[in-house]
């Protein structure tokens, strides 16, 4: 009778992860009698992955009852496939001995590949708010990926990005591997409703390709213009000073009215109007009493945005002057307001 | 025909030895591994040891370690158990069986037995 | 070692019953337990392998079950031929040892 032969007929074979991997094995012969154990890797340091004599392998089911005398097929299947099984595998014949069997045959191998998809990628950009015409940086990274080629693209609104940099990790062999790539975003004054999309296109992924995203109102930071008008009033010893504060985000903001450099009220933004780029406007006014004054008051608005140094806006009311021959032309700028918070 | 013919009948005295040869034919001989198994009379089976035929490895029962030897002759596809140092308590029927299991041990095939009795 | 006791050491049934014999091992065995029929003057014949694998050649009215410890060797239509004594044995490791028999006798 001829020698035995190990029969492993797939040089390889490749699974997606989360599926089960068959490994085909079949002997020519019956004997020597002798179990047949499964191993990944050769050498001393070759892992156990079945043995068919004992031993608990949750993960392996063997393809026909190996219990039977006669049987000569010894494929195995192993179950939920991670990245980190792949390797090349091994049906390894052993004949009987004492006190250990003996290794008597060895299929040649099955290379088991797996195809894992990508995670979600996770876009990140910098922890502290950045102006218009600044250049910001924002990161992307997804793991977990087999094989290792993947696509990585950049859009801002829809338009690709060109200025980024990628790298896939490891450069050597690995179960699986990781993507990091940061891309260069300059900020405009229209970004706040703006969004920053990382794209990743991998084989596991049949076309689909994985987005991150991040919204540039995270990250950007508007500052306010401020316009401070005077306008009369009906009563002859009144004057209604108002603040015009523009095009701002975030919506975080403090007012605060000076009068000769001292101050008169402190208040928040609360009720603003929403302009479509996404940025506020607010407007505060200030009733200034002018019989209380027997010199020229200057009024300053000073506004604290977002955490920022106050910036600040002054306006020199005459005293001497009668109050409705000044500011004539501030009337109609208000009209268009839509919020009239008059103290 | 698949079979183990086993040698003729012994009559031994105390602290003799006896050799029994276990002929196999109709198999592959170096294939399986073969056990001898005794019953004495009246008595349950008793397992003496193991011999692989291939690689001659083998495996003795620890009660008799030291007085059984067990060989193979794979150009005459023979098995042979040698007990030394007789005792009655010895008297028994000596079966040789082939051993098939793949990842355990079971006996398929027997030889008919060769009693040996050990006495005065 | 492992240990091996079989139960009942006898039993009286007739033509038709069905029988059942049970066998422990004092360890885990996972599946490695074989069953033999002996006669008077008769080397042991396999019936089961592997707990409840059927030997070539025998009648399917044996069977086997039983994983671990705990074996069971059941002749569900006992025949004049079944007569005999039976024993379990386990194969997992050396040293092999069997049970200590159970006769099936004529009601």
């Known amino acids: 009778e001829e020698e035995l032969q190990v029969i492993q007929p797939d040089k390889s074979v490749l699974v997606a992860a989360g599926e089960t991997a068959t490994l085909r094995c079949t002997a020519t012969s019956l004997i020597p009698v002798g179990p047949i154990q499964w191993f990944r890797g050769a050498g001393p340091g070759r892992e156990l992955i079945y043995n068919q004599k004992e031993g608990h392998f949750p993960r392996v089911t063997t393809v026909s009852e190996l219990t039977k005398r006669e049987n000569m097929d010894f494929s195995i299947r192993i179950g939920n496939i991670t990245p980190a099984d792949a390797g090349t595998y091994y049906c390894v014949k052993f004949r009987k001995g004492s006190p250990d069997d003996v290794e008597f045959k060895s299929g040649a191998g099955t290379e088991l590949s797996v195809r894992a998809k990508p995670s979600a990628p996770v876009v990140s950009g910098p922890a502290a708010r950045a102006t218009p015409q600044h250049t910001v940086s924002f990161t992307c990274e997804s793991h977990g990926f087999s094989p290792r080629d993947i696509t990585l693209k950049w859009f801002k609104n829809g338009n690709e990005l060109s200025d980024f940099q990628t790298n896939v990790d490891p450069v050597g062999e690995s179960v699986s591997y990781s993507i990091h790539s940061t891309a260069k975003v300059v900020l405009t004054r229209e970004d706040v409703h703006s969004q920053v999309i990382c794209e990743v296109a991998h084989v596991t992924l049949q076309g689909d390709p994985l987005r991150g995203t991040a919204n540039l109102s995270e990250t950007i930071r508007v500052p306010p213009t401020l316009e401070v008008t005077q306008q009369p009033v009906r009563a002859e010893n009144q004057v209604n000073v108002t603040c015009q504060v523009r095009k701002f985000y975030p919506q975080r903001l403090q007012l605060t009215w000076l009068e000769n450099g001292n101050v008169s009220r402190t208040e928040t933004a609360s009720t603003v109007t929403e302009n479509k780029d996404g940025t506020y406007n607010w407007m505060s006014w200030l009733l200034v009493n002018v019989s209380a004054h027997r010199d020229d008051v200057k009024l300053t608005c000073q506004v604290e945005h977002d955490g920022q140094p106050a910036v600040s806006k002054s306006h020199d009311l005459k005293v001497s002057a009668h109050p409705k021959e000044q500011g004539s032309n501030t009337a109609a700028e208000n009209t268009g307001s839509n919020e009239r918070n008059i103290y | 025909q698949v079979q183990l013919v086993q040698s003729g009948a012994e009559v031994k005295k105390p602290g003799a030895s006896v050799k029994v040869s276990c002929k196999a034919s109709?198999?592959?001989?170096?294939?399986?591994?073969i056990s001898w198994v005794r019953q004495a009379p009246g008595q349950g089976l008793e397992w003496m040891g193991w011999?692989?035929?291939?690689?001659?490895?083998?495996n003795y029962a620890q009660k008799l370690q030291g007085r059984v030897t067990m060989t193979t002759d794979t150009s005459t596809s023979t098995a042979y158990m040698e007990l030394r140092s007789l005792r009655s308590d010895d008297t028994a029927v000596y079966y040789c069986?082939?051993?098939?299991?793949?990842?355990?041990?079971?006996?398929?095939?027997w030889g008919r037995g060769t009693l040996v009795t050990v006495s005065s | 070692d492992i240990q091996m006791t079989q139960s009942p050491s006898s039993v009286s049934a007739s033509v038709g019953d069905r029988v059942t014999i049970t066998c422990r091992a004092s360890?885990?065995?996972?599946?490695?337990l074989a069953w033999y029929q002996q006669k008077p003057g008769k080397a042991p014949k396999l019936l089961i392998y592997?707990?409840?694998n059927l030997q070539s050649g025998v009648p399917s009215r044996f069977s086997g079950s039983g994983s671990g410890t705990d074996f069971t060797l059941t002749i569900s239509s006992l025949q004049p031929e079944d007569f005999a004594t039976y024993y379990c044995?386990?194969?997992?490791?050396?040293?092999?040892?069997f049970g200590g028999g159970t006769k099936v006798e004529i009601k």
């Open positions: 069986a082939r051993e098939a299991g793949s990842s355990w041990y079971d006996f398929d095939l």
């Open positions: 109709g198999y592959t001989f170096g294939g399986y591994g």
């Open positions: 011999i692989s035929a291939y690689g001659g490895e083998t």
């Open positions: 360890q885990g065995i996972s599946s490695w």
């Open positions: 592997a707990a409840s």
């Open positions: 044995q386990q194969g997992a490791s050396f040293p092999i040892t």
